[in-house]
Amino acid sequence: NKILVKQSPMLVAYDNAVNLSCKYSYNLFSREFRASLHKGLDSAVEVCVVYGNYSQQLQVYSKTGFNCDGKLGNESVTFYLQNLYVNQTDIYFCKIEVMYPPPYLDNEKSNGTIIHVKGKHLCPSPLFPGPSKP
């Protein structure tokens, strides 16, 4: 038995920040779980990990270069990524493991979310129009 994960197909980070919501076919209330966010088609780079426990606050771990926070919903974990750079544009996959209560469960691979980080570009000021020629 596998947990299904739904993610937005694409998110655009205009202000170098984005909320990526991972929605699960499983209620996380009063569960001990590990939710994680992985970068790249092969999910090779784990960028955020959230541990949830019925008796403690969420514990959020971030990879160097990623400023990550997590928020828990009944059937979701939302990863809040800040200070993103253009070169962190990529596809990101949500993963979930539930440890307690038994049985241990994990997820079917999701379709992922493409996060497109828009660079901060200064808008060029319009040129001062010169005198029009007759």
Partner: nanobody
């Protein structure tokens, strides 16, 4: 069974430094996370910092910029470098680890006995 052994505690003056170590031993598949908690007299145990085997980190606001955590996966050991120590850092520091005892998934949480850090002039 899995054992966690802390070392490196002691007495240090305000502004000084200490380096704590926590080594995991026994029979297990892999380590997920290794964390440091602390408990001061009459206070609740609080999370100080933690690290995953992949090097992802987590710091309490009160220690950011002063404490640095690192992990040596080959030695199953976590290190806590504590700089600019303050009297309010005085506490018993406990190591905690989420450890996978088999490759089939799931983890268990283990605790060490603690090492005392006293910051006093």
């Amino acid at each position: 069974d899995v054992q966690l052994v802390e070392s490196g505690g002691g007495v240090v003056q305000p502004g000084g430094s200490l380096r704590l170590s926590c080594a995991a031993s026994g029979s297990f598949f892999s380590i997920d996370t290794m964390d440091w908690y602390r408990q001061a007299p009459g206070k609740q145990r609080e999370l100080v910092t933690g690290v995953t085997s992949g090097g992802l980190t987590n710091y309490a606001d009160s220690v950011k910029g002063r404490f640095t955590i690192s992990i040596d996966n080959a030695k199953n050991t976590v290190y806590l470098q504590m700089n600019s120590l303050r009297p309010e850092d005085t506490a018993l520091y406990y190591c905690s680890a989420r450890i996978r005892t088999s490759g089939g998934g799931g983890w268990s949480t283990y605790w060490g006995q603690g090492t005392l850090v006293t910051v006093s002039s």
